[in-house]
Every structure is written in C-alpha cells, then in structure tokens.
C-alpha cells in the first residue's frame, strides 16, 4: 500500500486518504460515498444488501 504521490494503487483499487491505504473498488458497492470510490470506475454501484 502506497503513500500518496508514489506509485498508484494496484488495478481495481483506489487510494483512501481517510484510511491512508489503497482500498478495493469492489467495496464501493457497500460504501459508495467512500473517498476511495472517487478514484474508481464511474459506473454506478449495484444496489447493496439492504
């Protein structure tokens, strides 16, 4: 997991300043408002569990 300004996160993940780590874009289905999701694909998340 990289610090901001170094190599980007691996494919399918995006940097979260809140958590200070790369986060899986898959998590945006559950947490679409996460700061990491700003860097993920623009497709809208599928409806989540509830």
């Amino acid at each position: 997991e990289q610090a901001p300004g170094t190599a980007p996160c691996s494919r399918g993940s995006s940097w979260s300043a809140d958590l200070d780590k790369c986060m899986d874009c898959a998590s945006c289905r559950a947490r679409p408002h996460s700061d990491a999701c700003l860097g993920c694909a623009a497709a809208p998340p599928a409806p989540f569990r509830l």
Epitope: D20, A26, S27, R29, R31, H33, R49
Partner: antibody, heavy 119, light 111 residues
Framework: QVQLQQSGGGLVQPGGSMKLSCIAS????????MSWVRQSPEKGLEWVAE??????????HYAESVKGKFTISRDDSKSRFFLQMNNLRAEDTGIYYC??????????WGQGTDLTVSS | DIVMTQTPASLAVSLGQRATISCRAS??????????MHWYQQKPGQPPKLLIK???SLESGVPARFSGSGSGTDFTLNIHPVEEDDTATYYC?????????FGGGTKLEIK
C-alpha cells in the same frame, strides 16, 4: 500493528446475560464496520451482528437467531465495541470473535472468547 | 439466506501437489464486475485468517501459492504447491447481502 483484544465470556446459566468487549488498536477504528462472529461444532462459523460507522449512521444488523436478544454497540472515542447478550440459551454456546470489516470481508480478528451456556 | 456449500469436507494432499476446494452459493453473488466471495484459513486455536477477497484478489502477505477463481455461484480455492504449514480448515464467505454466511469448511491434511 493491528490488534483486537477481547474480554468477557465464560460460563452462564440459561436465561442469563453476558457482555463481550473488544478493544481495537493499530487501524482507523472509526472508519470500519465491526462485527461479532461465533463458531461452534454444530453450526460452524456464524455471523452474529454488525455495527457500521458514523458515516453510515451507526446502523446495526443482526442474524435472525439473535434479533431481540443481542445488542451491538461501539464507542469510537475509545476504539472499542460490545455485544450485550441476554436470554442466553444452550445454542448460543461457542467461541465468539470480534472482527472488523471495511465493507465485505472480515479483515482483522480478535483472539476469540469462549461462552458456555449451561446449568 | 444464501447457503454456502463447500466440498469436499476433508481432503488429504501430498506435499507439493495441488489442493482444490470448491464453494457453491445458493444464488449468484457476482455483479458484472466483482464477485463478493472471500476465503479464510483457520488453524486450531486461532481465529480465521483472510486469504482471498472478491473471489480472486490475494490478501497482502498471503503466499502466491494460494489462488481463487469463479463467479456467479461456483468458486474455487487452489493451493499449489501445498506445504506442511497449509494444514488447516478453509472457509468461504459471501458478502452479497445480510446475513453474511460461511461455508461449512474443508479440512486439509498434508500427506
């Protein structure tokens, strides 16, 4: 270094109550959803309850088998969370683990604590 | 609730060979992009440890001998080559909806 330190558990009589605690360190506790997962030879690994983060309005969810009996809560200021268990029955016996999840998978786990419900 | 069925219940594999564990969900746990299936390893007296997230993404620090695949309802965990230290019980778990449910486990023994 991430740690989830559990306390509570032990022997309790049927119909009794018990409170489990979990203190977290080494990660951004307030941003994570927290769960309790239990394990028994009869039922294997079983998710019990979840409490989400402040940004998710501290929403809580429970397994059907514990709804109305168990209450999950958290204290972000002290990086700890709890499971209050009431009206315990023999089928609640097992090892209880606290665990953190950002969204989907159980990332960090406590060491586990034994609960035995027996007269 | 989504029922997770793991096979086999137990497995004995020779050192250096391949171990294959299957997990079937009672309904799809995948979108067009991601599968909400995860794998854990548990050794006696220890909590489960995350190995694979989202069906095929290796958790940080987990050896590349572990790999996951599948989508929809059918998923597989492969370990190759197996090592002595891989003796454990392996579980799948979905996060498609609440309640999250786990498979019944596969106990791996190394011959």
């Amino acid at each position: 270094q991430v740690q989830l330190q559990q306390s509570g558990g032990g022997l309790v009589q049927p119909g009794g109550s018990m409170k489990l605690s979990c203190i977290a360190s080494g990660f951004t506790f307030s941003s994570y959803w927290m769960s309790w997962v239990r394990q028994s030879p009869e039922k294997g690994l079983e998710w019990v309850a979840e409490i989400r983060s402040k940004s998710d309005n501290y929403a809580t969810h429970y397994a059907e088998s514990v709804k109305g009996k168990f209450t999950i809560s958290r204290d972000d200021s002290k990086s700890r969370f709890f499971l209050q268990m009431n009206n315990l029955r023999a089928e609640d016996t097992g090892i209880y683990y606290c665990s953190s999840t950002y969204a989907d998978y159980f990332h960090y786990w406590g060491q586990g604590t034994d609960l035995t419900v027996s007269s | 609730d989504i029922v997770m069925t793991q096979t086999p219940a137990s497995l004995a594999v020779s050192l250096g060979q391949r171990a294959t564990i299957s997990c079937r969900a009672s309904q799809s746990v995948s979108t067009s992009t991601y599968s909400y299936m995860h794998w854990y390893q548990q050794k006696p007296g220890q909590p489960p440890k995350l190995l694979i997230k989202y069906a095929s993404s290796l958790e940080s620090g987990v050896p590349a001998r572990f790999s996951g695949s599948g989508s929809g309802t059918d998923f597989t965990l492969n370990i190759h080559p197996v090592e002595e230290d891989d003796t454990a019980t392996y579980y799948c778990q979905h996060s498609w909806e609440i309640p999250y449910t786990f498979g019944g486990g596969t106990k791996l023994e190394i011959k």
